[in-house]
Interface confidence: medium
């Protein structure tokens, strides 16, 4: 267009700019090795390094791995972004007792209000449940499970929330009290697909990083890229996304070009040894409840949780035989892998059918 000529001319003779006909304006030419963050960059700050997927560009311009929320007690709060790590928080039904950078080092189950008390403020990812005395006239039997949560035998001590992954506990010393609560938590996970699709589809170009228009001829690539499975951290460093490839882990949130993947223990397992964005060791839940009843969803949490059956209906928890024999699964559609080593230290209750998978590892059937 002739009328564009004056604008185009302003770019000539200025090696740091080029004319983009699509937007009809002069654009800043990103230096070699940097990519534009927009179609027509205007200034040096519109250019940056590129990192592999699951890495983000940190404040020091370094590609750094996003944290993963792969521990069984964590969920992703905010995704891995090009300039910030993924942020994890305690999963529904739990709160954070020991915080960590972009995550939580230790999550505890929300306390259950004891008899005669009702929930004043439901627990959140940051705070425990707050209880208050029940109004006069409310039966201790608590007709409404929403207002009064009566403890079942074997539930967690009311005064103390139960940690899901004690820092120093070995699998054999993991707290097995609170089986009902653990069962509720395990059951609640079944509302989610146990495996989310991997984000690493190995795209030929990274849509989160590539400019909408190719770099002008001769300008070279205009910002930093990272290899798949890496993300660009806040400092512009390509950092590895954590991997959920262990058979006892599932991907919670995908690896993005600017944030790490997060992993968590498979449904039916809890994290015995935590790791950033992941879990170093998953162990089976010590499930003791043979039956649960659905409870309305928490206000702040979206996963369905489960209420224990009435007091006195709690079955005994009988460990499976030492040799690992257990009834065959009758519902193969939703099975949960269990670490074979961990299953030796934590009994799998007979109320949860176990079958051996083709790998020889027991498969805990969710029913």
């Amino acid at each position: 267009f002739p009328q564009d000529r004056p604008f185009e001319d302003t770019c000539h003779g200025n090696p740091s700019h080029y004319y983009d006909k699509a937007v009809r304006r002069c654009c800043y030419r990103c230096p070699m090795g940097l990519f534009p963050t927009q179609q027509c960059p205007q200034r040096p700050t519109d250019c940056r390094k590129q990192c592999e997927p699951d890495y983000y560009l940190d404040e020091a311009d370094r590609c750094t791995a996003c944290v993963t929320c792969s521990r069984d007690d964590l969920v992703e709060k905010t995704p891995c972004a090009w300039n910030s790590s993924r942020v994890c928080e305690c999963r529904p039904g739990m709160f954070c007792s020991t915080s960590a950078v972009n995550s939580c080092a230790r999550c505890f189950f929300h306390s259950v209000c004891p008899a005669g008390m009702i929930v004043k403020f439901p627990g959140t990812a940051q705070k425990n449940t707050v209880c208050e005395p029940a109004s006069p006239g409310v039966s201790p039997a608590c007709a409404s499970p929403e207002n009064c949560k009566e403890p079942s035998s074997g539930t967690i001590p009311q005064a103390k929330p139960t940690p899901v992954s004690p820092a120093t506990s070995s699998a054999s010393t993991m707290p097995v009290r609170g089986g009902t609560r653990l069962a509720q938590e395990a059951a609640s996970k079944l509302t989610r697909a146990p495996d989310s699709p991997s984000s690493v589809g190995r795209p030929s170009s990274d849509p989160g990083l590539s400019p909408t228009q190719p770099c002008p001829e001769g300008s070279g690539d205009c910002r930093k890229q990272c290899e798949p499975d890496y993300y660009l951290d806040e400092a512009g460093r390509c950092t590895a996304c954590v991997s959920c490839s262990r058979d006892d882990l599932v991907e919670k949130t995908p690896c993005a070009w600017n944030s790490s993947r997060t992993c968590e223990c498979r449904p039916g397992m809890i994290c015995a040894t935590s790791a950033t964005n992941s879990c170093a060791r998953c162990v089976p839940y010590p499930i003791c409840a043979a039956e649960t009843v659905t409870k309305p969803q928490d206000m702040a949490e979206k996963d369905t949780t489960f209420e224990a059956p009435p007091l006195g209906t709690q079955p005994d928890c009988n460990p499976t035989p030492e040799n690992g024999e257990a009834p065959a699964s009758t519902s193969p559609t939703q099975s949960l892998l269990v670490d074979s080593q961990a299953s030796k230290t934590l009994p799998i209750p007979t109320s949860a059918p176990v079958a051996l998978s083709s790998t020889g590892k027991p498969v805990l059937d969710a029913g």
Epitope: C63, S204, E227, V242, A280
Partner: antibody, heavy 118, light 107 residues
Framework: QVQLVQSGAEVKKPGASVKVSCKAS????????IHWIKQAPGQGLEWIGY????????DYNQNFKDKATLTADKSSSTAYMELSSLRSEDTAVYYC???????????WGQGTLVTVSS | DIVMTQSPSSLSASVGDRVTITCKAS??????VAWYQQKPGQSPKLLIY???TRHTGVPDRFTGSGSGTDYTLTISSLQPEDFATYYC?????????FGGGTKVEIK
Amino acid sequence: QVQLVQSGAEVKKPGASVKVSCKASGYTFTSYWIHWIKQAPGQGLEWIGYINPSSSYTDYNQNFKDKATLTADKSSSTAYMELSSLRSEDTAVYYCARREDYVPFAYWGQGTLVTVSS
Amino acid sequence: DIVMTQSPSSLSASVGDRVTITCKASQDVSTAVAWYQQKPGQSPKLLIYWASTRHTGVPDRFTGSGSGTDYTLTISSLQPEDFATYYCQQHYRIPHTFGGGTKVEIK
């Protein structure tokens, strides 16, 4: 199956340049970045840099920014590393390697020995 | 750059021995640590990644562990084919960096 096949050994004089190739097969070449790693005789491993064959985007270890140039030819599924201004300390085995989705350096080339000697 | 300090640099052991190699990162690498085995004249072979995940086909006598800055490779019962040099690597941040290596020799 995935294979990375490197070019043969080279003997070069100081000051010269050498171009090592790494031919990929068994997968879509543009889907994975190619890394290059140096191993001097009797020494450990040193990451040189990587290239995204899809866009030819490269990033280097600062120690190799003025030494190595990485390129890729999509038509032949081959990655190249050119080493310039060779010195005796550049004598090493150079490997190309590829990551798997979650896995660092799951696949390696057989290595190319570059000897710099007057 | 992240420095990976590996120890010991060499060790002598017998078949059946339990061998432990450690690697210390100069900063937290969020379990993004891999271990490789290399035999003379061969390319390195991936054993462990993400600190504790065994690569396909790697025998279960090889175990990786650790978090933060401290990582360990353990060979529970050394076999004749395990005599080699082992390297740790952080794949947490670019540039990737390797430990100096541990040569496992026959006693």
